[in-house]
């Protein structure tokens, strides 16, 4: 089984410039327990929550989110309404975090290109960032040193070979689209920025968070590329300055125990198996 991936696609309808839709999907074998969509940065790192979606409880959303919904069992969409005369969404980063079992939490971000001209020239490659939760870094300087060394090695190696192509995607030709992909390995995309960090936050799949049926079955389309609502093959317009962060660790507070799937759940638990999470959200 390959490393899970999260894709993010931001669309602005050509007919309605104040209407945006964020599409996100999870490609992996795990069971999705929660999806958080934020803007202005990753959730918990300067970003502001726009919506939280649970596969059975439903969805919570906050302005300017208009409608959050599941498109498939492993992808969601969030419609946004821009009431302002100017369009603040155009320069905004949107992030989607998928909490899955047993992989942990994976997040990816993307944004619209600054120009609204559909005929943009070839864009730069998104920058992959391995993001670390601060609490997980403490006391793990050794891991960080190793990571920095590895990243430097990658940087050096990338200079001596061409930038690989992004994975092909399907986008709506009627929309301006930005897509950010979380590659299976960091080396699959060019590392242009020196400030990447290594994620050290991990929530192990302990016995009390184990899936009742063992490993979850593969999502029906996990092996395929994501497909937009009205998809037609075209070259995606990638956001300038968009980035991807791959985070393999469920987001728990330091010192918080992984809750059990039975009674006595910890409030607002972020690190838990699907049964414990499968039962609370409703689309609002």
């Amino acid at each position: 089984a390959g490393t899970p991936e999260v894709w993010v696609q931001v669309q602005m309808e050509a007919t309605e410039l104040s209407s945006f839709t964020v599409h996100c999907g999870f490609l992996g074998p795990g069971s999705i327990s929660l999806v958080t969509v934020s803007w202005g940065g990753p959730d918990g790192a300067g970003g502001t929550k726009l919506a939280v979606l649970h596969p059975e409880l439903g969805t919570r959303q906050w302005a300017p989110a208009r409608q959050a919904r599941w498109e498939t069992q492993s992808s969601i969409s969030l419609a946004l309404e821009d009431s302002g005369a100017s369009s603040p969404f155009a320069n905004t980063t949107f992030c989607c975090k998928f909490a899955s079992f047993p992989e942990g939490s994976w997040e990816s971000c993307g944004s619209l290109p600054p120009s609204s001209d559909p005929g943009l020239s070839a864009p730069p490659t998104p920058v992959p960032i391995l993001r670390a939760d601060l609490a997980g870094i403490l006391g793990l300087s050794g891991v960080l040193l190793f990571g920095c060394g590895y990243l430097l090695h990658l940087l050096r190696r990338q200079k001596h070979r061409p930038t690989p192509r992004l994975q092909p995607s399907h986008t709506n030709s009627q929309a301006l689209t930005a897509q950010a992909w979380a590659p299976s390995q960091a080396s699959q995309a060019a590392l242009h920025d020196p400030y990447a960090t290594i994620n050290t936050s991990f929530c192990p799949a302990t016995l009390d968070t184990a899936h009742p049926n063992g490993w979850a079955s593969l999502p029906t389309h996990a092996a395929h590329q994501p497909q937009g609502p009205a998809a037609s093959a075209s070259t995606p317009i990638l956001a300038r300055g968009s980035f991807v962060s791959v985070e393999n660790g469920l987001y728990t507070q330091a010192g918080e125990r992984p809750p059990h799937t039975g009674p006595g759940l910890t409030l607002f638990p972020d690190c838990r198996g699907p049964r414990a999470l499968e039962g609370r959200f409703g689309v609002r």
Epitope: T48, W70, L267, R280
Partner: antibody
Framework: EVQLVQSGAEVKKPGSSVKVSCKAS????????IEWVRQAPGQGLEWIGE????????NYNEKFKGRVTFTADESTSTAYMELSSLRSEDTAVYYC???????WGQGTLVTVSS | DIVMTQSPDSLAVSLGERATINCKSS????????????LAWYQQKPGQPPKLLIY???TRESGVPDRFSGSGSGTDFTLTISSLQAEDVAVYYC?????????FGQGTKLEIK
């Protein structure tokens, strides 16, 4: 174990305001919405609205818009609901709840009487 | 707003017998994307807050006895208590968890015959 503890019962005059508090413990306060639901004597449950403590983003039931205000204090993990221009039909038990109505406070009885 | 209508308003069942409560929504609570129904059931005993029993129309909350089960799809849902116990005497509510605002049924009072 998550707990939501609400402030005590209140008796108010028509036209006045009431502010009910809801203190959360046992989890990450800013992760999920705090919901407010009320129940008039012998009646059903009515959603008033919600607040997301981290960003103070809110959603209100149209019926209560303009009369209700939600606030949250992350430093004390406490959410507040203030209802103004009280009338007799606002007499009810007011509940705070979280995580998609999985956790509930014990309720606060607000009596509006002249 | 989605209107939730429960039937019957009250129900008297003998101990050990089956109790069935119905809930009808004015709009479908089925999300076509992931084929999930966003409906929840709550139990409320006198002087207590409601307690979540069932979510996703049929998934039992942790710690809820298996005599409680939920079924249905779209607009028609059912809560079944397979063998009524004395402690099950309460008011039961269904709730639209599909779209804003969350709305509740008027409640069904369950008593022992």
């Amino acid at each position: 174990e998550v707990q939501l503890v609400q402030s005590g019962a209140e008796v108010k005059k028509p036209g006045s305001s009431v502010k009910v508090s809801c203190k959360a413990s046992g989890g990450t306060f800013s992760s999920f919405s705090i919901e407010w639901v009320r129940q008039a004597p012998g009646q059903g449950l009515e959603w008033i609205g919600e607040i997301l403590p981290g960003s103070n983003s809110t959603n209100y039931n149209e019926k209560f818009k303009g009369r209700v205000t939600f606030t949250a204090d992350e430093s004390t993990s406490t959410a507040y609901m203030e209802l103004s221009s009280l009338r007799s039909e606002d007499t009810a038990v007011y509940y705070c709840s979280s995580y998609w109505f999985a956790y509930w406070g014990q309720g606060t009885l607000v009596t509006v009487s002249s | 707003d989605i209107v939730m209508t429960q039937s019957p308003d009250s129900l008297a069942v003998s101990l050990g017998e089956r109790a069935t409560i119905n809930c009808k929504s004015s709009q479908s609570l089925l999300n076509s994307g992931n084929q999930k129904n966003y409906l929840a059931w709550y139990q409320q005993k006198p002087g207590q807050p409601p307690k979540l029993l069932i979510y996703g129309a049929s998934t039992r909350e942790s710690g809820v006895p298996d005599r409680f089960s939920g079924s249905g799809s779209g607009t028609d849902f059912t809560l079944t208590i397979s063998s009524l116990q004395a402690e099950d005497v309460a008011v039961y509510y269904c709730q639209n968890a599909h779209s804003y605002p969350p709305t509740f049924g008027q409640g069904t009072k369950l008593e022992i015959k």
